[in-house]
């Protein structure tokens, strides 16, 4: 049996009918299913174009997946009285392309937010902080799930997608309490260097299935609570000494490095030495070379220094075309 990070209840649900009556505090919105016993509302695959206004005050888990929301404006979930119990909000696959500043304001108990599988052409720097102050009130978020939020190339803004996401993660230092961050499958070429320093409480970081080529400018030093670092399915060629030392210095971490195109030349020697003695890398016996051709599919743990050579660089006068 496998356990996912969010689960839905199997308690009975009440399907609501559209009503001409003014909404009662605990009435179920049209096109939704509600279970007060499970504190759960599901408005799933209903092609909703906006967040229902008449959500019951008891809602703790809200699923708004598979809709057509397009834009999440400021105060999209602000109600009077507020949705004070709402702890888990899943908006995945709802065709969101714009999340504006303050979209999640007035949700004092929001611990888990899933925006995965939305092509976010615009993510406001203040989407999670709700404030443009240099230091804003801390967000209650503990888990932020942003897998596959990269928009198609023709919908991208001029600025880098990595930079846009990073700005939202660090704004106002609001996410200092974040424990879990998933950023998988976003075509990231690099990780902006200041991001992790602003997320000191991280325990679980998933950067798998991106296009990261190097971690040279990324610092993990501050992430003393980090337990899981997922770097599978990237474009990593080698990890250099600085990165190796930082990872080894994290007291609790498990690192996942499968399915990267490791280049087994002279620059790989330090990493191989480290791999042989570290307990940090999960499944390290599965890591294999991708390049050069003569080394393809060799197991990194089985290499020695004699295997790891670099072709001498010819002086320009001797190079041939």
């Amino acid at each position: 049996t496998s356990s996912a990070s969010s689960s839905s209840s199997s308690a009975p649900f009440l399907a609501s009918a559209a009503s001409a009556q003014p909404p009662l505090p605990d009435q179920c919105p049209a096109l939704c299913e509600c279970s007060e016993a499970a504190r759960t509302v599901k408005c799933v695959n209903r092609n909703l174009t906006e967040v229902p206004t008449d959500l019951p005050l008891y809602v703790r888990n809200l699923f708004l997946t598979g809709n057509q929301l397009a834009v999440l404006p400021a105060g999209a979930f602000a109600r009077r009285p507020p949705l004070a119990e709402l702890a888990a909000l899943n908006l995945s696959g709802s065709r969101l392309d714009e999340v504006r500043g303050g979209a999640f304001e007035h949700l004092p108990s929001l611990r888990q937010l899933d925006l995965s599988h939305n092509p976010l052409a615009y993510l406001s720097p203040f989407a999670f902080s709700g404030s443009n102050a240099s230091i804003s009130a801390p967000s209650p978020l503990v888990e932020l799930i942003l897998n596959h939020i990269v928009p198609p190339d023709d919908k991208r803004q001029n600025r880098s997608f990595e930079g846009m996401v990073a700005a939202a993660l660090v704004a106002g230092r609001a996410l200092q309490g974040l424990h879990l961050l998933e950023l998988a499958s976003n075509h990231f070429l690099y990780l902006p260097r200041d991001v992790l320093a602003q997320l000191p409480s991280l325990r679980y970081l998933d950067l798998s299935n991106n296009s990261l080529v190097s971690l040279t400018y990324v610092s993990f030093r501050n992430l003393t609570h980090l337990e899981s670092l997922h770097l599978e399915d990237n474009a990593l060629k080698v990890l250099h000494n600085g990165t190796l030392a930082e990872l080894q210095g994290l007291p609790h971490v498990r690192v996942f490095l499968d399915n990267n195109p490791w280049v087994c030349d002279c620059h790989m020697a330090d990493m191989v030495t480290w791999l042989k003695q570290t307990g940090v890398v999960q499944g390290k016996d599965r890591l294999t070379c991708a390049f050069p051709e003569k080394m393809r599919n060799r197991v990194l743990l089985e290499l020695n220094s004699a295997d790891l050579d670099c072709d001498p660089i010819l002086p320009p006068s001797l190079q041939t075309s």
């Epitope: 496998s2 996912a4 998933e182 999960q282």
Partner: nanobody, 120 residues
Framework: EVQLVESGGGLVQPGGSLRLSCAAS????????MSWVRQAPGKEREWVAS????????RYADSVKGRFTISRDNAKNTLYLQMNSLRAEDTAVYYC?????????????WGQGTLVTVSS
């Protein structure tokens, strides 16, 4: 198929001891760090202890430090938790946890749990 099967739970008096076991199959046990996690009635799951691949490094929640010992036998594909000086607040279902890959891919595996009850 990944399987984790816990055993060794039961009723014990305060101050007593128990040894939990977790038999693992379906993956290369020796390649992965492992953990014990517990859930007391009406409470959230709480991490208890972890151990690295070869057992060279262990760590513990403050609440169990000095009383519990995590260990593993890679030849037997088994994880252990020796629990001494048990207290009423240790009453919980204890789960063995193996994280083999990203959670979003369903690669965070749990056993069915074994109940430990500490009561006089």
């Amino acid at each position: 198929e990944v399987q984790l099967v816990e055993s060794g739970g039961g009723l014990v008096q305060p101050g007593g001891s128990l040894r939990l076991s977790c038999a693992a199959s379906g993956f290369t046990f020796s390649s992965y760090a492992m953990s014990w996690v517990r859930q007391a009635p009406g409470k959230e799951r709480e991490w208890v202890a972890s151990i690295t691949t070869a057992g060279g490094s262990t760590r513990y929640a403050d609440s169990v430090k000095g009383r519990f010992t995590i260990s593993r036998d890679n030849a037997k594909n088994t994880l252990y938790l020796q629990m001494n000086s048990l207290r009423a607040e240790d009453t919980a279902v204890y789960y063995c946890n193996a994280e083999l890959g990203p959670r979003r891919l369903g690669m965070d595996y749990w056993g069915q749990g074994t109940l430990v009850t500490v009561s006089s």
